[in-house]
Interface confidence: medium
């Protein structure tokens, strides 16, 4: 499966849930569907408080049973690792796929962990991460923030992903914002054309 | 926005080969799996062939295995259909449709369709 | 062959409500999600109902879908005249994409 590089903020604001988990083991085959679930238990819900209303957990995560279908297959053996995953919420179910965002929890920078937890909710809907995957590119507004990690780190895992979120700077204007201790200092040339 | 657009469509005779041709904008073809679905004159719709995003896993329906292939080229965002020993029962208006990439289950979004007509 | 079940037609009144039945089996319907697509004269279908009853955005909540079983439903409240179309519902079927024979709306 072939999947577009995601900021994580973007995979955030785009999910309907967001939860940190650990998954109990192989995945169950549901015969006649598309689909097979992993058993999951969930740890903490980051996002997807209002859709979800008064269930209490996910015990299954449902991805496309075959690969080539952008199914996920889940390949760490420890039960007790916890990952972040991003998905989707369909009939009360959590769905993911190969493209989802789904990382453990510890390779997460410190800063994306706090911006999963209370950060990058602020710039959902008001805010867009624009990604700069070729020269020239061109922020196309100014709730836009040029997302250069793939060219100048040659990954979608770059400074901009590990440490700064898009976030409105006044009703018109979105910035970068860094996600130290203190969230008032900007990129650089952020609005800059690159 | 998304937008699918199919060509090759044509009188052909009986046993003849067409290729159909999909070229896909608005969105980052690789990572949805593409479908074609045909519509006889007059008849319902019916789904014909699916291949996955990498273009690695392809499905047909029993009516066209063994006679149609599917393909993609995802550098030029196009989907394909390749139809040999064409049969009169193939006449149909042929749509490219994209599978959703997180419930593959259904398609999202439809070409306007190209018309295929097997005739002697 | 048609895997789901739809009756030809089905026609209405401006203003009222008819219903679409679709009748699958435990392969499709009983065990996989149901979407309904509309197809207007000359022109592609185009996804209404997904998740057996969920709307894509833009699709008025005139249009409703439930499912009970193995078979679904389509229901169209305060019909309008934009309403005539096709209407088909599609399932998934062990490694297949099945679509019902279609229902012609007529809006009389």
């Known amino acids: 499966c072939s999947c577009a590089p995601t900021h994580p903020q973007t995979a955030f604001c785009n999910s309907d849930l967001v939860i940190r988990a650990k998954f109990m083991g192989s995945p169950e085959i549901i015969e006649t569907t598309l689909y097979q679930r992993y058993e999951i238990k969930m740890t903490k819900m980051l996002k997807g408080f209002d859709a979800v209303g008064n269930a209490t957990g996910f015990r299954f995560a449902y991805t496309p049973a075959m690969e080539s279908l952008c199914g996920y297959v889940h390949k760490s053996q420890n039960r007790s690792e916890e990952f972040l995953i991003a998905g989707r919420l369909r009939n009360g179910n959590l769905h993911i796929t190969a493209c989802s965002f789904l990382v453990p929890w510890h390779n997460l920078s410190p800063a994306q962990q706090k911006a999963f937890v209370k950060t990058y909710s602020a710039g959902c809907g008001v805010c867009t991460v624009f990604p700069c995957s070729a020269i020239p590119c061109k922020l196309e507004s100014d709730s836009h923030c040029l997302w250069t990690d793939q060219i100048l780190m040659g990954s979608e895992k770059g400074y901009q992903s590990d440490h700064f979120a898009c976030l409105p700077r006044n009703p018109d204007l979105c910035t970068w914002q860094y996600l130290g201790v203190s969230m008032t200092r900007s990129l650089p040339l952020a609005k800059a054309e690159a | 926005q998304v937008q699918l657009v199919e060509s090759g469509g044509g009188l052909v005779q009986p046993g003849g080969s067409l290729r159909l041709s999909c070229a896909a904008s608005?969105?980052?073809?690789?990572?949805?799996?593409m479908s074609w679905v045909r519509q006889a004159p007059g008849k319902g719709l019916e789904w014909v062939s699916a291949?996955?995003?990498?273009?690695?896993?392809?499905y047909y329906a029993d009516s066209v295995k063994g006679r149609f292939t599917i393909s993609r080229d995802n550098s030029k965002n196009t989907l394909y259909l390749q139809m040999n020993s064409l049969r009169a029962e193939d006449t149909a208006v042929y749509y490219c449709?994209?599978?959703?990439?997180?419930?593959?289950?259904?398609?999202?979004?439809w070409g306007q369709g190209t018309l295929v007509t097997v005739s002697s | 062959d048609i895997v789901l079940t739809q009756p030809p037609s089905v026609s209405g009144a401006p203003g009222q409500r008819v219903t679409i039945s679709c009748s699958g089996s435990?392969?499709?319907?009983?065990?996989?999600?149901v979407s309904w697509y509309q197809q207007l004269p000359g022109t592609a279908p185009k996804l209404l109902i997904y998740?057996?009853?969920q709307r894509p955005s833009g699709v008025p909540d005139r249009f409703s879908g439930s499912k009970s079983g193995t078979s679904a439903s389509l229901a169209i409240t305060g019909l309008q005249s934009e309403d005539e179309a096709d209407y088909y519902c599609?399932?998934?079927?062990?490694?297949?994409?099945?679509f019902g024979g279609g229902t012609k709306l007529t809006v009389l």
């Open positions: 608005g969105f980052t073809f690789s990572s949805y799996a």
């Open positions: 291949i996955s995003g990498s273009g690695g896993s392809t």
């Open positions: 449709a994209r599978l959703d990439t997180y419930y593959p289950d259904l398609f999202d979004y």
């Open positions: 435990s392969s499709n319907i009983g065990s996989n999600y």
């Open positions: 998740d057996n009853n």
């Open positions: 599609q399932s998934y079927d062990q490694r297949k994409w099945v």
